[in-house]
Every structure is written in structure tokens, then in C-alpha cells.
Interface confidence: medium
């Protein structure tokens, strides 16, 4: 997260760290007791490493009573996701067992109504991604509030040049932005999960390249079918 600040500890109990061989790789969001939603591209970076999900964490390194690392029983990328595109960049991870819920571990309601968030709405994005262009990684969860940007503006030739589909949304990226390591994390508007940080190699914090988020409402049928 660029230009953000440290999150209040455990105030986002849905927040997950998707880890490979014990290292944070991507963000994720607990959407059901046994399921974490993340970005499909995160799996590509996992290679053959052991994928696990950390829940109940604020600090990645310090012991915390609520922290628990779960093995992954099943990884379900969206069937249409492809390595060369950010389309359908969603991944569902089934935990080896139901998460132990509590004040610091709780699923987040996700948007099912397939309607665009009003441009200008401030949405919260959180993650353990880099906090500087030099690549500094935080130990504690960071967050930032970003105004949603309308799709037409986001699709301007000088910005994303038509790449933003109806199944994606954008947020402003002027100094404050999601970045490498935040992919798969939640974009929360009004207490509801609206978007998932896409995992392309987009430049961060540059107004000309707004943040791109996969709209979960557009994938309600797929999410329901996997969770069923």
C-alpha cells in the first residue's frame, strides 16, 4: 500500500495473507468459514511451493493470539483466468478446515448486486504489499482509502486504454494506491467487499495508471457455485 497508514490491529478480521513457503505473497479475503478469495495470478507466482493462508494477523512476524496458519485443501482459479491478461483474476482457496472465528477472524459480506460503485465513493484497500517504490515491505497491515474512478475515465487512451471491462473497477492512484504484494486483497466500500486487487505488473501511485480491481458482484454465480 502506497501513501497509506498502519491499519488498526485486527479491525479487518476478514483480511488474509496468502503465503508460499511461509512468505507473504498476496492478500486475500475470508468470504466464508472455509474459503478465502484472492487473485488468480497469485498462484502463478507460487510455482510449486506450499500455499498456506494466514488469518487473524496484524503483524506478519510477531506472535499474536488470533493468528493461525491454514493449509489449503483446494485452489480454484477462475476457469477463464489467463497468465497474459488480468481478466477474471479471481482465485478461491478452500482451507483445510473451517476457520476458527472470533473478533479477529470473520468473513466479509460480498456484493451480489451487479451494479457499479458510484464514482467518488471512498473505498478501503488493505494489505502487506510494498509501501515504497524502493520495495520496502511492511510487517504490519497497512490500509488506504481510495476514491472510485469511473470506467470511462479509467479507459482513456492515456490511462488504461480500453482494457477495463464491465467486470472490473478502478480507483484513483494519485500518490495513494495498492501495489505489489497487495494483489488478491479486498477493496471494501461501505463495509461490503466490492473488489479484489488485480495482480498485474501495473506501476503504482501514478495518476495515469489507476488501480484495477475485479468486481466480485460480476462473479457472484461462479463464487456461489464453488462455495456450494
Amino acid at each position: 500500500i502506497l501513501g497509506g497508514r498502519e491499519a488498526e490491529a485486527h479491525a479487518r478480521p476478514y483480511m488474509a495473507s496468502v503465503q508460499v513457503n511461509g512468505e507473504h505473497l498476496c492478500g486475500g479475503v475470508l468470504v466464508a468459514e472455509q474459503w478465502v478469495l484472492s487473485a488468480a495470478h497469485c498462484l502463478e507466482d507460487a510455482a510449486d511451493g506450499k500455499v498456506q493462508v494466514l488469518l487473524g494477523a496484524h503483524s506478519l512476524s510477531q506472535p499474536e493470539p488470533s493468528k493461525r496458519l491454514y493449509d489449503v485443501l483446494r485452489a480454484v482459479p477462475h476457469p477463464d483466468s489467463r497468465p497474459d491478461t488480468i481478466d477474471h483474476d479471481l482465485l478461491l482457496l478452500q482451507l483445510s478446515e473451517k476457520a476458527t472465528l472470533g473478533p479477529a477472524v470473520r468473513p466479509l459480506p460480498w456484493q451480489r448486486v451487479d451494479r457499479d460503485v458510484e464514482p467518488g465513493t471512498l473505498c478501503d484497500v488493505a494489505g502487506w504489499g510494498i509501501v515504497s517504490h524502493a520495495g520496502r515491505r511492511p510487517d504490519r497491515l497497512q490500509h488506504v482509502l481510495l476514491p472510485v474512478l469511473d470506467r470511462a475515465t479509467c479507459n482513456r487512451r492515456t490511462h488504461h486504454d480500453g482494457a477495463i471491462t464491465q467486470r472490473m473497477m478502478c480507483a484513483e492512484s494519485n500518490r495513494r494506491d495498492s501495489c505489489k504484494g497487495d494483489s488478491g486483497g479486498p477493496l471494501v466500500c461501505g463495509g461490503v467487499l466490492e473488489g479484489v486487487v488485480t495482480s498485474g505488473s501495473r506501476v503504482c501511485g501514478n495518476r495515469k495508471k489507476p488501480g484495477i480491481y475485479t468486481r466480485v458482484a460480476s462473479y457472484a454465480a461462479w463464487i456461489d457455485s464453488v462455495l456450494a
Partner: antibody
């Protein structure tokens, strides 16, 4: 020093239009949005809309859509608000303010009084 | 639209006292709330944003608190120059909306 300098008071006839300007100085104009606010009877504040000079992107309060038109001239770091088809209900003080979009207005113009009278 | 309600139109206090001005949002706005002070004949001035962060140059007598739907601006050790109208504003979602204002009177 950050300043937003607005045009002086306007006395206009019903049905006419008025264009208020807001000249920004002391900061990079395209780094911040400009918001416009109406204050009637010296009390309540109403948000009219925002314009983002970088994207040329506007957001309006539906109540003022069609009544107010927001524009900017980046070369002179000036924001404009045109008010159309004026009635006595539009008599008020109008403020422009700077905002970085992540909170309200941090610097305000001195206000422009618009009086609609025949 | 989100309605911001300042239940007290007027509040009376004495120099040196502490006063709390409240604002209630009709729905959850998180901490996306600002407070403004407007002295007679002047433009509004930003005091507090993100519910509790003081704007540059604002005396630490002014404190903001709250989240969700209930917000408070507290002025400690009230000074005569604090005579003004105080407005809350939410910027969580469009349209941005203001409270009706509270006039602080100094006895």
C-alpha cells in the same frame, strides 16, 4: 501561500446565467480537486459538485445537475462554475474549496455572493 | 443521500469551559467526516478530517472523535475567538453532505 481567489459579488436578473471564477495559487492545480459549495441564508452548506482538473472529471449533486456546470482552465489554474436559469432560490454565497479528494475542503475561497433580483 | 444531523442548533458556553458538538450520520460513514469552523462574515475553515485528524495549524484544544454514525467535536478551554458556526461533513460517498450547523455562543 495557498489561495483561492473568487470573483466579486454578482447581481443578476431572474432567468439569466452567471459564471463564477476561482483562481488557485500556491500549489499544483492539477494535484487537487476543486469543490463548490452553496451557503444560503448564512447558515446551511450544500455540496454542489467537484471537478478534478487532472482528469477533467466532474461529480455533481443531483440537486444541482443542470443548474451548475463546472469547468477548469488548467493554463490559468482557474476553476469556473456557471449557474443557469437563475431564480431567487439561487441567491446565496457560493464557495470554491480545494480538496485532495480524501477529505473535505482544506482551503476555501472568500465566497461569491450571488443575488437574483429583477 | 446520507443525512448529517447536528441536533443542537445553538450551544452556549463560557470561556475556559469544555464543549462537545455532536453530529449523527444516517448511515455508516466510517471515519470519513470533517469538521469546519465558520466565523461571522468568513469562509469555512477545516478543523478536523478523518473524524479525528487535526488540520495544519489548528490548536490542539480542538479534538474530533467517533466512527460509524456518531461523531463529536470537542473544544477544550473555550476561547472567545471560538464563537462561530461549526459544521460536520461526510465524504464517504456522493453526494457529500453537511450537517445543519451548530452556533457556539460565548456567555
Amino acid at each position: 501561500e495557498i489561495q483561492l481567489q473568487q470573483t466579486g459579488p454578482e447581481l443578476v436578473k431572474p432567468g439569466a446565467s452567471v459564471k463564477i471564477s476561482c483562481k488557485a495559487s500556491g500549489y499544483s492545480f492539477t494535484d487537487y480537486i476543486i469543490l463548490w459549495v452553496k451557503q444560503s441564508h448564512g447558515k446551511s452548506l450544500e455540496w454542489i459538485g467537484n471537478i478534478n482538473p487532472y482528469y477533467d472529471y466532474t461529480s455533481y449533486n443531483l440537486k444541482f445537475k443542470g443548474k451548475a456546470t463546472l469547468t477548469v482552465d488548467k493554463s490559468s489554474s482557474t476553476a469556473y462554475m456557471q449557474l443557469n436559469s437563475l431564480t431567487s432560490e439561487d441567491s446565496a454565497v457560493y464557495y470554491c474549496a480545494r480538496s485532495d479528494g480524501y477529505y473535505g475542503g482544506d482551503y476555501w475561497g472568500q465566497g461569491t455572493s450571488v443575488t437574483v433580483s429583477s | 443521500d446520507i443525512v448529517m444531523t447536528q441536533s443542537h442548533k445553538f450551544m452556549s458556553t463560557s470561556v475556559g469551559d469544555r464543549v462537545s458538538i455532536t453530529c449523527k450520520a444516517s448511515q455508516d460513514v466510517g471515519t470519513a467526516v470533517a469538521w469546519y469552523q465558520q466565523k461571522p462574515g468568513q469562509s469555512p475553515k477545516l478543523l478536523i478530517y478523518w473524524a479525528s485528524t487535526r488540520h495544519t495549524g489548528v490548536p490542539d484544544r480542538f479534538t474530533g472523535s467517533g466512527s460509524g454514525t456518531d461523531f463529536t467535536l470537542t473544544i477544550n478551554n473555550v476561547q472567545s475567538e471560538d464563537l462561530a458556526d461549526y459544521f460536520c461533513q461526510q465524504y464517504s460517498s456522493y453526494p457529500w453532505t453537511f450537517g445543519g450547523g451548530t452556533t457556539l455562543e460565548i456567555k
